[in-house]
Interface confidence: low
Amino acid sequence: EAHKSEIAHRYNDLGEQHFKGLVLIAFSQYLQKCSYDEHAKLVQEVTDFAKTCVADESAANCDKSLHTLFGDKLCAIPNLRENYGELADCCTKQEPERNECFLQHKDDNPSLPPFERPEAEAMCTSFKENPTTFMGHYLHEVARRHPYFYAPELLYYAEQYNEILTQCCAEADKESCLTPKLDGVKEKALVSSVRQRMKCSSMQKFGERAFKAWAVARLSQTFPNADFAEITKLATDLTKVNKECCHGDLLECADDRAELAKYMCENQATISSKLQTCCDKPLLKKAHCLSEVEHDTMPADLPAIAADFVEDQEVCKNYAEAKDVFLGTFLYEYSRRHPDYSVSLLLRLAKKYEATLEKCCAEANPPACYGTVLAEFQPLVEEPKNLVKTNCDLYEKLGEYGFQNAILVRYTQKAPQVSTPTLVEAARNLGRVGTKCCTLPEDQRLPCVEDYLSAILNRVCLLHEKTPVSEHVTKCCSGSLVERRPCFSALTVDETYVPKEFKAETFTFHSDICTLPEKEKQIKKQTALAELVKHKPKATAEQLKTVMDDFAQFLDTCCKAADKDTCFSTEGPNLVTRCKDALA
């Protein structure tokens, strides 16, 4: 229903705490360079204004759209052009063009320093002094680095953060309580960020229909006992929620997500038998829990898929009468039978089925033509299954760090023109798939591996779009989202690449590396590995292993030496010479 004042409506629905959090996230995602204090001031002004509208919906400006109200606030920031350059031009436009302009200027890779966690005592002190400001800083720092982070989910992670600090700051050994717990939240939040970015990419590049297809497949896998009408309703609602969040309409998004959670909990009997535990939780935890709820038990008596989609004499008639509905029911029926497939694979199968019907229904004898379609699925299914087996075997053999290195070599050979930091980030993220997925039961590996890889490769594509340097990457990123992962997997060594000259300074290290945390040390070594491959793209695995082992030995020796600086300055050049010889 229409409300006189949209801002009053959302404030009433969400409550002050969530309202303020979401407005802070929205501003931080739009203007990523502003400080927390600048944004906090704007948030307070917007909240005070919302309260006046709650008191009197007819008050001045209360009838304005949220985009107008928020956009006006952002455009009133002093020194906008000096700090944000051409983003300031957005302020010359009218809504809805102004908001579209802000969205286009969101930066997926802002030049901000990494979000460093203060040491435990300091963190606990500032948390105890002002928990609200502390959590505000958390929302601001995450949102500005991840401008498409799913806002209601970020509120959930902030709540987790809050609970961890409340618990651990009361303990004697704060550090050992905080570190593993906060690391766990960070890891989950980073995965959530790349997954959501993938959803927004799907929406932005291919529209609502593509996202809805993704949602139908995913929901059908999770809720195989729900009927097609129920799945369609949930997919439509989920599409609306994601469209709003991807479009910067965070208050509407959070409100509609809460509504969807409420609907699911009120209709458990027609959706799934697994929802009760989630539905007993408070709002943020409930919505998060529902988003990753375990799959319901599959109905025991599902007929073979062929009955309705291959053997039925009316296939072409049914397809012609309502293409989207017919393909939707195919995707629903296939997905509910295959919780062991990735959503990407299910969408590829649906696409293959659609292409087959398009071709066959125009022929003289359609049933003879489409009769083999299910057999034609086989190679499409085998390819990701083989990918999972090969990569999980390699992960089990090498461990996470070694597996990341193998991927780094592979991807540097595929796209050597890509910047080394991007290759290292991508390889480290892709390599985590082993730890995340290869330890799962067999039937959960494929969906975990492929859907995670697709999300990471989406980030590779987004970063590459800003400065396109590799034709290989451009080719894979230009196609449909579901074809990206197979495209990247099929890439081989880029034969057009002219190897980089060997520069000794690239492989020169100093004693400061010894005091770096383990993760930073790994990144330094992986940076060197990528540079080696760029110098010798056709180096064998054996050659690279020899060099990297030598390098590790050199670091170990010099970091244990009494005079580290002398060791690095004398042994370093020897290492460089040995590397050149090994790769000659």
Partner: nanobody
Framework: EVQLVESGGGLVQPGGSLRLSCAAS????????MSWVRQAPGKGPEWVSA????????RYAESVKGRFTISRDNAKKTLYLQMNSLKPEDTAVYYC????????GSQGTQVTVSS
């Protein structure tokens, strides 16, 4: 093999009552939500009511709310539908289904409401 066998249908006057039963076999009955679906002559299947695996949560179509009650006995592997204040428009073949699907292959039981 999964089997669902409905019983309890019959001819009843408007305002009367019937209790339908559905005996299940061939699957772990207690692990699945169940539904009642009906199909009137010349019409498509219509979902009537659903119950979760434990029997705690029940749902009804608007047209039967307040008149029909769904229940289950997991020990007996049986689903029930108590129908009160029956109306002529309740006339249909009633069948039970696993989950909330309207396309299950049981025979169903005929309910006719007529004076």
């Amino acid at each position: 093999e999964v089997q669902l066998v409905e019983s309890g249908g019959g001819l009843v006057q408007p305002g009367g009552s019937l209790r339908l039963s559905c005996a299940a076999s061939g699957f772990t009955f207690g692990s699945f939500g169940m539904s009642w679906v009906r199909q009137a002559p010349g019409k498509g299947p219509e979902w009537v009511s659903a119950i979760d695996s434990g029997g705690a949560d029940t749902r009804y179509a608007e047209s039967v709310k307040g008149r029909f009650t769904i229940s289950r006995d997991n020990a007996k592997k049986t689903l029930y539908l108590q129908m009160n204040s029956l109306k002529p428009e309740d006339t249909a073949v009633y069948y039970c289904t696993i989950g909330r699907s309207t396309s299950r292959g049981s025979q169903g039981t005929q309910v006719t409401v007529s004076s």
